[in-house]
């Protein structure tokens, strides 16, 4: 650092900026001598408004420094990102966003829960709001799933009228024939592939209604499809294996007591879906009077032994192999309670006794020619077989 050129004049003695220090410290600085500035933790080098990671100035032959002195400014993380369906609170002080400041994110109570972390973020020396787990992106307020106003039990086809908030995941799909679906998260609808197959290349033609109780009521939340994903293993007009589809909505819907997503089954869900366990199907499909229901109806039906169901559909007019391992059956041997045309795509839901949340076990798929027929059963897509498929699509799109 010491280059003695006696002809050259020394540069002005540099003064380190506040919250910074200078190195090396010398008695004087002459031609080609240099110094660097280092800021204390939580302070950043700025040349005016320009960020610098490092700074060094060199003494020139005319006795001036080649660079102006930078400043060490306290790191400011700036206003934190907004949290959809949540809020942010300044803990350190009103609007304080500088080094070591703390903020607390929280989600709207009841209908949203925080995913990823506890919501506490600190403004770190690198200028980013950071959680205790080291995440820089804000948390996510995920809709709480499987909440229902309905108490379990109680005695569609052979069903009864639903009350507000009983089936808040219920989605009415118009645009082709009447069909149904179930809300997942706040921007996906789970349905049957056969119910929306005709619209697979024209997602925008689907008229999607949430929060409705009466099929023809003007009181509903309108949603539109951004994209339709039909299971690649589904073949139209060749049976109902892999009869499952997802609709991505073009906007997130606001969750409330009348619009709430259904849960996907946990790994342990099979224990709540054994033979004779009760599931609930809901929809606006044909009732015993042979007409589409005006009011949302529901029916509680037991799961039927798979072999028994397979056998029931091996007799003509059905062909052998109609019931696959990707299906589950539900209904009464005596008949009278079933889902029917117009219910397709709706969820067959079960109560998870451990979490006390409702989850989708089946999707209304197909059944006997005559709904509620004795010795025949409603056939549902077995959702638990498709969890990897569902999660893959939702995470990629």
């Amino acid at each position: 650092h010491h280059h003695h050129h006696h002809a050259s004049q020394p540069c002005p003695y540099p003064m380190a900026p506040p919250n910074g220090h200078l190195s090396p410290v010398q008695a004087k600085y002459i031609l080609k001598d240099s110094f660097s500035i280092f800021c204390e933790p939580g302070y950043e080098l700025l040349q005016g408004h320009l960020p610098l990671k490092s700074f060094a100035a060199v003494c020139q032959k005319d006795g001036s420094w080649d660079q102006p002195m930078p400043s060490c400014s306290i790191v400011d993380c700036g206003p934190p990102d907004d949290l959809p369906s949540g809020r942010v609170e300044y803990i350190t002080g009103p609007e304080v966003t500088t080094y070591k400041a703390v903020i607390q994110y929280s989600c709207e109570e009841t209908f949203y829960t925080m995913k990823v972390n506890d919501g506490k973020y600190v403004c770190e020396a690198d200028g980013f709001w950071t959680s205790s787990k080291g995440e820089r992106s804000p948390p996510v307020c995920e809709p709480v799933c499987g909440l229902s106003a309905r108490t379990t039990g109680g005695r569609i086809y052979g069903g009864q009228k639903a009350k507000p908030g009983d089936f808040p995941w219920q989605v009415l799909i118009l645009g082709g024939s009447t069909a149904a679906g179930a809300l997942l998260y706040d921007n996906w609808v789970l349905t049957a592939a056969h119910a929306i197959y005709e619209q697979k290349h024209d997602a925008s033609s689907l008229d999607i209604r949430l929060g409705a109780l009466k099929r023809l009521s003007p009181h509903y939340t309108q949603a539109w499809a951004e994209a339709v994903f039909i299971h690649e293993g589904y073949t139209h007009d060749a049976g109902f294996d892999n009869d499952i589809a997802l609709i991505k909505l073009n906007n997130k819907v606001v969750i409330n007591s009348n619009i709430t997503p259904i849960c996907l089954p946990r790994k342990e869900a099979e224990s709540f879906m054994r033979t004779d366990d009760i599931g609930t199907a809901s929809g606006w499909g044909l009732t015993q009077r042979g007409l589409l229901a005006r009011n949302l109806m529901y029916v509680d039906i037991p799961i039927v032994d798979h072999q028994k169901c397979t056998a029931a559909y091996e007799k003509p007019p059905y062909s052998g192999g109609s019931v696959t391992a990707n299906m589950l059956c539900a209904g009464l041997e005596s008949g009278g309670k079933d889902s029917c045309r117009g219910d397709a795509g709706g969820a067959l839901v079960f109560l998870d006794n451990e979490t006390q949340r409702w989850f989708v076990g089946g999707i209304v798929s197909w059944g006997s020619m005559n709904c509620g027929e004795a010795g025949q059963y409603g056939v549902y897509t077995k959702v638990i077989n498709y969890i990897p498929w569902i999660k893959n699509i939702i995470s990629n799109f």
Partner: antibody, heavy 117, light 112 residues
């Protein structure tokens, strides 16, 4: 010697998004400094749009804040400009540049973007 | 926004002449850290602008010493002591002291 090169579509339709990339050679964008986007309108008026710093923090020209996003891909040593809801008023030559103690010491050669139906 | 006003908008010169371009800002360019972030750029047709001068008077590397900058507060000047053919183009002053940073409208240096 650091070199910067802009790339992206030369024609964008109104209401769509304009997306440009700046590929940097001869210097790592994470090593130091700020990396800027500037545009020059027909008639030669120059406007600074914003920068992304070596650490990934951004600073935007306030009138553009609601429409602009500057991001980066450190593995490719590139940084990007996205400008949403463009109008014919966004027709300009777009430059990327690097600062130090000065604002724009090194510039790309610029790319003309026309906004037209 | 800080308005940067350049005069003249056009400057006809003969080779070897001294040229002087003035730039006035609508407010002081002294930053809170004491530095003045006033810069000069030059642009030739079909090329990107090039930095000439920063912090009022410092020459950028490779810039000939016939270019000099001076001024303080709100009034600044770029001088070219002997104009050469390669100096013809448009000159812009720029302030980096206040965000948003802003450019002047430009001064065209051309042959008489």
């Amino acid at each position: 010697e650091v070199q910067l090169q802009e790339s992206g579509p030369g024609l964008v339709k109104p209401s769509q998004s304009l997306s440009l990339a700046c590929t940097v050679t001869g210097y790592s964008i994470t090593s130091d400094y700020a990396w800027h986007w500037i545009r020059q309108f027909p008639g030669n008026k120059l406007e600074w749009m914003g920068f992304i710093s070596y650490s990934g923090r951004t600073n935007y020209n306030p009138p553009l804040t609601s429409r602009i996003s500057i991001t980066r891909d450190t593995s490719k040593n590139q940084f990007f400009l996205q400008l949403n809801s463009v109008t014919t008023e966004d027709t300009a030559t777009y430059y990327c540049a690097r600062s130090y103690d000065y604002w724009f010491g090194y510039w790309g050669q610029g790319t003309l973007v026309t906004v037209s139906a | 926004n800080v308005l940067m006003t350049q005069t003249p908008l056009s400057l006809p010169v003969s080779l070897g002449d001294q040229a002087s371009i003035s730039c006035r800002s609508s407010q002081s360019l002294v930053h809170s850290n004491g530095n003045t972030y006033l810069e000069w750029y030059m642009q030739k047709p079909g090329q990107s602008p090039k930095l000439l001068i920063y912090t009022v008077s410092r020459r950028f590397s490779g810039v000939p010493d016939r270019f000099s900058g001076s001024g303080s507060g709100t009034d600044f000047t770029l001088k070219i002591s002997r104009v050469e053919a390669e100096d013809l183009g448009v000159y812009y002053c720029f302030q980096g002291s206040h965000v948003p940073v802003t450019f002047g409208a430009g001064t065209k240096l051309e042959l008489k």
